[in-house]
């Protein structure tokens, strides 16, 4: 289809991407599915500038991003290289902690209350952020 020049209604434009910020919670996989059904993906943070933008909009609330290590190495959902890319982990994180008693370790990354990242149990119902590139975004999405 033809490229779009503005973000869908209720999405926020920033640096040629469109962002949607949830106000309720889902497990990581369910949040991922939500974004996909919107022709988007969980947010991929590629710079300190983007980190600050997202952090400003989500506030001090645990919020999923598009980063996980469910299949071994850490991977961004859009294929962005993790090893050479931007990172903002809390000290001592990620730690794949098993002490939560929920079974398994911690395979999904989220923004913490101070914006830095932590790995946590993917089933926790956190808020999330969807992102889509501006030239892929529709102009008039459903009202949310």
């Amino acid at each position: 289809g033809s490229e779009r020049t503005c973000c869908p209604v209720n999405w926020v434009e920033h640096e040629r991407s469109c962002y949607w910020f949830s106000r309720s919670g889902k497990a990581w996989a369910d949040a991922d599915n939500y974004c996909r059904l919107e022709d988007a993906h969980l947010v991929v943070v590629t710079s300190w500038e983007e980190q600050k933008f997202v952090q400003h909009h989500i506030g001090p609330v645990n919020t999923w991003m598009g980063l996980h290590d469910q299949n071994g190495p850490w991977k961004w959902v859009d294929g962005t290289d993790y090893e050479t890319g931007f990172k903002n982990w809390r000290p001592e994180q990620p730690d794949d902690w098993y002490g939560h008693g929920l079974g398994g370790g911690e395979d999904c990354a989220h923004f913490t209350d101070d914006g830095r990242w932590n790995d946590d149990v993917c089933q926790r119902p956190y808020r999330w952020v969807c992102e889509t590139e501006l030239d892929k975004a529709s102009q008039e999405p459903p009202l949310l």
């Epitope: 209720n10 309720s24 919107e38 008039e140 949310l144």
Partner: antibody, heavy 120, light 107 residues
Framework: EVQLLESGGGLVQPGGSLRLSCAAS????????MSWVRQAPGKGLEWVSA????????HYADSVKGRFTISRDNSKNTLYLQMNSLRAEDTAVYSC?????????????WGQGTLVTVSS | DIQMTQSPSSVSASVGDRVTITCRAS??????LAWYQQKPGKAPKLLIY???SLQSGVPSRFSGSGSGTDFTLTISSLQPEDFATYSC?????????FGQGTKVEIR
Amino acid sequence: EVQLLESGGGLVQPGGSLRLSCAASGFTFSTYAMSWVRQAPGKGLEWVSAISRSGGNTHYADSVKGRFTISRDNSKNTLYLQMNSLRAEDTAVYSCAKDGFGGSSYFDYWGQGTLVTVSS
Amino acid sequence: DIQMTQSPSSVSASVGDRVTITCRASQGINNWLAWYQQKPGKAPKLLIYGVSSLQSGVPSRFSGSGSGTDFTLTISSLQPEDFATYSCQQANSFPWTFGQGTKVEIR
């Protein structure tokens, strides 16, 4: 006024195929995810499949995965459901439903449905 | 899959009655719950979403509540046009699933 009109239902033998269509009007079709939901006689509602605005992402109920294919043509404001390898248990009224709130997904408008009967 | 179980399966009531329908999820659904009304031969109508948000145009006698796995639809004063089948739906996880329906009949 939002309208969803299904067509393509009918009687088909087990193992056969049908293609359902849903013609949409009264809203900007290309900006909403869409779903198919079915209701077997005397039974409750069952979600069948969903498709994203562009058609690039799809989801299916396990009961139809590998047999049914959802698609859409935004230039024609039409949603489709290709149904292959039909079984008796697929007998139901099939309705298309519009996503009202993004990928939530709650359905704020539904079609009246088209009856699919699978019988020999 | 998340199973949605409604009770009762049917209820007989009179105009003006308060009617309560419950829906129980087999696991937590993070408040991703909707209620629909369906009349014979008609398309379902969205009444409530997000547990308690009233869809535009739906009368205020309909209300929803609950959290976790247990949810309730209440009709505060039943009207003649409310005799129908009511279904809950979870939208937390694929596959989205519905309750089996509760038929509200005239006593």
